[in-house]
């Protein structure tokens, strides 16, 4: 079931999913000057069986100017430099998260994809928060949020994280410094109240222990 709202906004913090639950959709967006091929997929979809999950469909972008050129292969190194998504070349989840049953890893890039990835999360998805550079995490509880459904309405739990203005950065789970690693899961809430925060974010991702920045919009 799709989450019909967005993860909460925490001042001076960003979030990311370490793995994507089956049912998650990723829009096939192309960078400026390119468009989806006419018969191309609108979305990639995380699907699977009991033993394996993977992304169905392939996103394909073609030049808006030319009609017949179809490209979908991994960008060449010189093309990667043009994009702000270079960290997506390789898996960025810790092994325990990426191999979570019923979850997909970050999809590989497609040529001429937009610099912003738009995901549509499903109920049960978890995202992890970290403070942006220059801010330090103060924890009252887990720095994570889960999409839950109550009375047919979806909402994200509130991450227990405060970011204070000190020159120290926190890390996502599985990265070298475990300072901001979440501890356990949020307690189940049964309230019918729905609180959502909608926003566009800059998300930091780690790729092969190097952190680069790209833009992701979580819907």
């Amino acid at each position: 079931e799709l989450c019909d709202d967005d993860p909460p906004e925490i001042p001076h913090a960003t979030f990311k999913a370490m793995a994507y639950k089956e049912g998650t959709m990723l829009n096939c967006e192309c960078k400026r000057g390119f468009r989806r091929i006419k018969s191309g997929s609108l979305y990639m979809l995380c699907t699977g069986n009991s033993s394996h999950s993977s992304w169905d469909n392939q996103c394909q972008c073609t030049s808006s100017a030319t009609r017949n050129t179809t490209k979908q292969v991994t960008p060449q190194p010189e093309e990667q430099k043009e994009r702000k998504t270079t960290e997506m070349q390789s898996p960025m989840q810790p092994v325990d998260q990426a191999s979570l049953p019923g979850h997909c890893r970050e999809p590989p890039p497609w040529e001429n994809e937009a610099t912003e990835r738009i995901y549509h999360f499903v109920v049960g998805q978890m995202v992890y928060y970290q403070c942006v550079q220059g801010y330090r995490a103060l924890h009252r509880g887990p720095a994570e949020s889960v999409c839950k459904m109550t009375h047919g309405k979806t909402r994200w739990t509130q991450p227990q994280l405060i970011c204070t203005g000190e020159m120290e950065t926190s890390q996502f789970p599985g990265e070298e410094k475990p300072q901001a690693s979440p501890e356990g899961r949020p307690e189940s809430e049964t309230s019918c109240l729905v609180t959502t925060t909608d926003f566009q974010i800059q998300t930091e991702m780690a790729a092969t222990m190097e952190t680069s920045i790209f833009t992701t919009e979580y819907q």
Epitope: M149, G152, K153
Partner: antibody, heavy 116, light 106 residues
């Protein structure tokens, strides 16, 4: 109490445009997506798309991508849907519905009639 | 797109009858939701997440099913229940509805 009040019925000429409004009250407008649903005469329900009022992100049913444009005005708690290049087959009742999961609140509907 | 096929399209029944409407999805979905609509009115949420009754909905309504096959049942049809019923999935975009089942007086 939650209310979604839509603008009145419209009669339009083929090729013209129409903008339907949906004014929300009784809840925090920016906390819920606003969806739009179409119902042609004697037909079923078709999802058109939604808007996230804060930020204005929209997601459309591909069928309506070139037909509908959904916008929102946070200052007046109002969502809008503009239909362009109207044809007779666009004659329908258009509903707004509050998102956040199942559609628990709906507008009363706006009948758009396209006729020459 | 996930296609939703309701059957029957029209159902003629009398007050007191047990009525069953089925909805078949072209792909497996997490949950089914059901709406009731009366002429000239907006749809009204009836059942959410397959089997849960929306606020104010009488207990004679029930829902069940999983995967691709779902059912709405009215245990004893009342005069107020003559209406059109729609199934709805929101497991994947685009969101889709069944074509509707009209429950009319026999």
């Amino acid at each position: 109490q939650v209310q979604l009040v839509q603008s009145g019925a419209e009669v339009k000429k083929p090729g013209s445009s129409v903008k339907v409004s949906c004014k929300a009250s009784g809840y925090t407008f920016t906390s819920y997506r606003m969806h739009w649903v179409r119902q042609a005469p004697g037909q079923g329900l078709e999802w058109i798309g939604y808007i996230r009022p804060r930020g204005g992100y929209t997601e459309y049913n591909q069928k309506f991508k070139d037909k509908a444009t959904i916008t929102a005005d946070e200052s007046t708690n109002t969502a809008y849907m503009e239909l362009s290049s109207l044809r007779s087959e666009d004659t329908a009742v258009y509903y707004c519905a509050r998102g956040g999961g199942v559609f628990d609140y709906w507008g009363q509907g706006t009948l758009v009639t396209v006729s020459s | 797109d996930i296609q939703m096929t309701q059957s029957p399209s029209t159902l003629s029944a009398s007050v007191g009858d047990r009525v069953t409407i089925t909805c078949s999805a072209s792909s497996s979905i997490s949950y089914m939701h059901w709406y009731q609509q009366k002429p000239g009115k907006a749809p009204k949420l009836l059942i959410y997440t397959t089997s849960n009754l929306a606020s104010g909905v009488p207990a004679r309504f029930s829902g069940s099913g999983s995967g691709t096959e779902f059912t709405l049942t009215i245990s004893s049809l009342q005069p107020d229940d003559f209406a059109t019923y729609y199934c709805h999935q929101r497991s994947t975009y685009p969101l889709t509805f069944g074509q509707g089942t009209k429950v009319e007086v026999k």
